[in-house]
Interface confidence: low
């Protein structure tokens, strides 16, 4: 359909509430440092303008693209250069270059303090102005996660509001709120990481990479749906994510709603697990479909070899319709293997493609590709063995100990990476233990590898901003599906020149005693990374001794009557002790 005014079209499709929410998210993801009130002003102006276009689509400027309208709004901010520096240079460009320029300035690691929930204050805010409370949530999440999936954020904001509706009535607000907020926070962080990987795959590896990923995932989840049905959903889903990753949030939300409608209208041919989802309102419906349980496999599936090895037309099919043929292979393999990670399925498809590429040029192709399925086994064994070993290590060491083992492992592999990034990434990698190791055997592999893909993407995104390690760049850019095996295969960097010993790095203060447990752990783990950067060849025994002594030193000073005085006296002794142990 063609519309005279795109903004009027989106306003009518989405309704005022969602339209405002999405515009707020869009501005917050671009101008991550602006105060909330500034954004509200911009949203108000855009909404008023959209309403004039709804009333008269021929009114002045109503025919302009949303990129043009949004970009003009951003560029009209008087303090843009003052607060955002070179972002203002984008304003000298024309569309579509201007929008591309804005996207490049999104900051994945913004300079924004961590949110600390204060139940009493939050309930007061909630009761005073629910609309503002909802908006503030969208703003705070969007500015911290500039690639957050916007329509999904609207869903989380509704859940957030529901939590407060319930808990602000409770006698003990904190007891009701804090666990629920923490649970929601984990969901939101996972959602942010999932979307960041989707955007990275589209932006760095192209739409085809994202479509392959979606094809595998949806084939696992909806094994009863046929290839054409899955392909149609994959194409539509790729459009939705391309739009959201590209900052076209209104179009993205609108198209996502259309896709949910299509899936629900055709659920009989897609999955038996969607009925409950399709009875829900729009945002919950889309979320529910995205999280839907895996359907049961059809009973009458042919052995895979039939179509992909034994068939005499394999090479003809491959040559004449490469993408479709490989797509059907990935679809058929994935629906039969709900236990495999998406990355593993894509690696298998890559090997299959490479084998056909090679064999179909030979004199006797069938003889050449007859054993292609045997080549898949080592690909399956590698992550399975790795997960087995790491889960055993996790059981033995517990979460904190396992994180420390990963800190040691990764600091030795890529010591050039900044300390905060190594700590963040290793801590997140360490969470795979509690997330996946307790799962049944058939869920472990997909749980672990798909989660690790999210964490390693975070490393790649952070590293891309300031590349410091050729090894990291290589693992991040050569192949999306081989990132995890690439990082796993890295060995300690023998070329690394150890960092000078800086005493200040191991200077601690009384604030350590009052920190929450996780922040205390981060301080200790930061020291561990710095220690390894100074002494990359430190033995496990030396590190264990240092960490033990550190714990004793902190415990001693935190039990002392004057914490700070104790740290001032014992700190230098501890540093001497460290140097002695590592000498």
């Amino acid at each position: 359909d063609t519309y005279k005014s795109e903004i009027a079209h989106r306003f009518k499709d989405l309704g005022e509430q969602y339209f405002k929410g999405l515009v707020l998210i869009a501005f917050s993801q671009h101008l991550q440092q602006c105060p909330y009130e500034e954004h509200v002003k911009l949203v108000r102006e855009v909404t008023e303008f959209a309403k004039t276009c709804v009333a008269d689509e021929s009114a002045e400027n109503c025919d302009k693209s949303i990129h043009t309208l949004f970009g003009d709004k951003l560029c009209a901010i008087p303090s843009l250069r003052e607060h955002y520096g070179d972002l203002a240079d984008c304003c000298e460009k024309e569309e579509p270059e201007r929008n591309e320029c804005f996207l490049q300035h999104k900051n994945d690691n913004p300079d924004i303090p961590k949110l600390k929930p204060d139940p009493v204050a939050l309930c007061a805010d909630f009761q005073e102005d629910e609309q503002k409370f909802w908006g503030k949530y969208l703003y705070e999440i969007a500015r911290r996660h500039p690639y957050f999936y916007a329509p999904e954020l609207l869903y989380y904001a509704i859940i957030y509001k529901d939590v407060f509706s319930e808990c602000c009535q409770a006698a003990d607000k904190a007891a009701c709120l804090l666990p629920k907020i923490e649970h929601l926070r984990e969901k939101v962080l996972t959602s942010a990481a999932k979307q960041r990987l989707k955007c990275a795959s589209i932006q760095k590896f192209g739409e085809r990479a994202f479509k392959a990923w979606s094809l595998a995932r949806l084939s696992q989840r909806f094994p009863k749906a046929d290839f054409t049905e899955i392909s149609k959903i994959v194409t539509d889903l790729a459009k939705v994510h391309k739009e959201c990753c590209h900052g076209d949030l209104l179009e993205c939300a609108d198209d996502r709603a259309d896709l949910a409608k299509y899936i629900c209208e055709n659920q009989d041919t897609i999955s038996t697990k969607l009925k409950e989802c399709c009875d829900k309102p729009l945002l919950e419906k889309s979320h529910c479909i995205a999280e839907a349980k895996r359907d049961e496999l059809p009973a009458d599936l042919n052995p895979l070899e039939h179509d992909f090895v034994e068939d005499k037309e394999v090479c003809k099919n491959y040559k004449e319709a490469k993408h479709v043929f490989l797509g059907t292979f990935l679809y058929e393999y994935s629906r039969r293997h709900p236990d495999y990670s998406v990355s593993l399925l894509l690696r298998i498809a890559k090997i299959y493609e490479a084998t056909l590429e090679d064999c179909c040029a030979k004199e006797d192709p069938p003889a050449c590709y007859a054993t292609v399925f045997d080549k898949f086994q080592p690909l399956v064994d590698e992550p399975k063995n790795l997960i087995k070993q790491n889960c055993e290590l996790f059981e033995k060491l517990g979460e904190y100990g396992f994180q420390n083992a990963l800190i040691v492992r990764y600091t030795k592999k890529v010591p050039q990476v900044s300390t905060p990034t190594l700590v963040e990434v290793a801590r997140k990698l360490g969470l795979v233990g509690s997330r996946c190791c307790k799962r049944p055997e058939e869920e472990r592999l997909s749980c672990a590898e798909d989660y690790l893909s999210l964490v390693l993407n975070r490393l790649c995104v952070l590293h891309e901003k300031t590349p410091v390690s050729e090894k990291v760049t290589k693992c991040c850019t050569e192949s999306l599906v081989n990132r995890r095996p690439c990082f796993s295969a890295l060995t300690p960097d023998e070329t690394y020149k150890p960092k000078e010993f800086v005493e200040g790095t191991f200077t601690f203060h009384a604030d350590l005693c009052t920190l929450p447990e996780d922040e205390k752990q981060i301080k200790k783990q930061t020291a561990l990374v710095e220690l390894l950067k100074h002494k990359p060849h430190a033995t496990e025994e030396q590190l264990r001794t240092v960490l033990g002594n550190f714990a004793a030193f902190v415990q001693k000073c935190c039990a002392a009557p004057d914490h700070e005085a104790c740290f001032a006296v014992e700190g230098p002794k501890f540093v001497i002790e460290i140097r002695g142990i590592l000498a």
Epitope: G85, N107, I112, S418, P420, T466
Partner: nanobody
Framework: EVQLLESGGGLVQPGGSLRLSCAAS????????VAWFRQAPGKGREFVAG????????YYADSVKGRFTISRDNSKNTLYLQMNSLRPEDTAVYYC???????????????????WGQGTLVTVSS
């Protein structure tokens, strides 16, 4: 609002050392890009050294590499510049600047730093 306050300047002989400090308030020093610039009489502000926010990556002007070291103490919310082997041409007012919202020193252009301290004078002379 970010406030920056430099100290540690003074008169020093060629070949001598000084340590400048820049205390920040209103924002954590480890969360944002911070840099030292200097301005000699009648000249523009020139980039000396910088350190990324959340990433321990340091940047130096060619003229000071190997002689100056930038560091920060997150617990004290303070940025430092250790200056060794000082030369007469290092004489200038030294300023620290910060770019909130930019965790990395992606620019050595003074205009892109919205927040500055009042400066501290370093004189290298015999």
């Amino acid at each position: 609002e970010v406030q920056l306050l430099e100290s540690g300047g003074g008169l020093v002989q060629p070949g001598g050392s000084l340590r400048l400090s820049c205390a920040a308030s209103g924002r954590y020093i480890d969360e944002t890009a911070v840099a030292w610039f200097r301005q000699a009489p009648g000249k523009g502000r020139e980039f000396v050294a910088g350190i990324g926010g959340g990433v321990d990556i340091t940047y130096y002007a060619d003229s000071v590499k190997g002689r100056f070291t930038i560091s920060r103490d997150n617990s004290k919310n303070t940025l430092y510049l250790q200056m060794n082997s000082l030369r007469p041409e290092d004489t200038a007012v030294y300023y620290c600047g910060t770019r909130p919202g930019r965790p990395l020193i992606t620019s050595k252009v003074a205009d892109l730093y919205p927040y500055w301290g009042q400066g501290t004078l370093v004189t290298v002379s015999s």
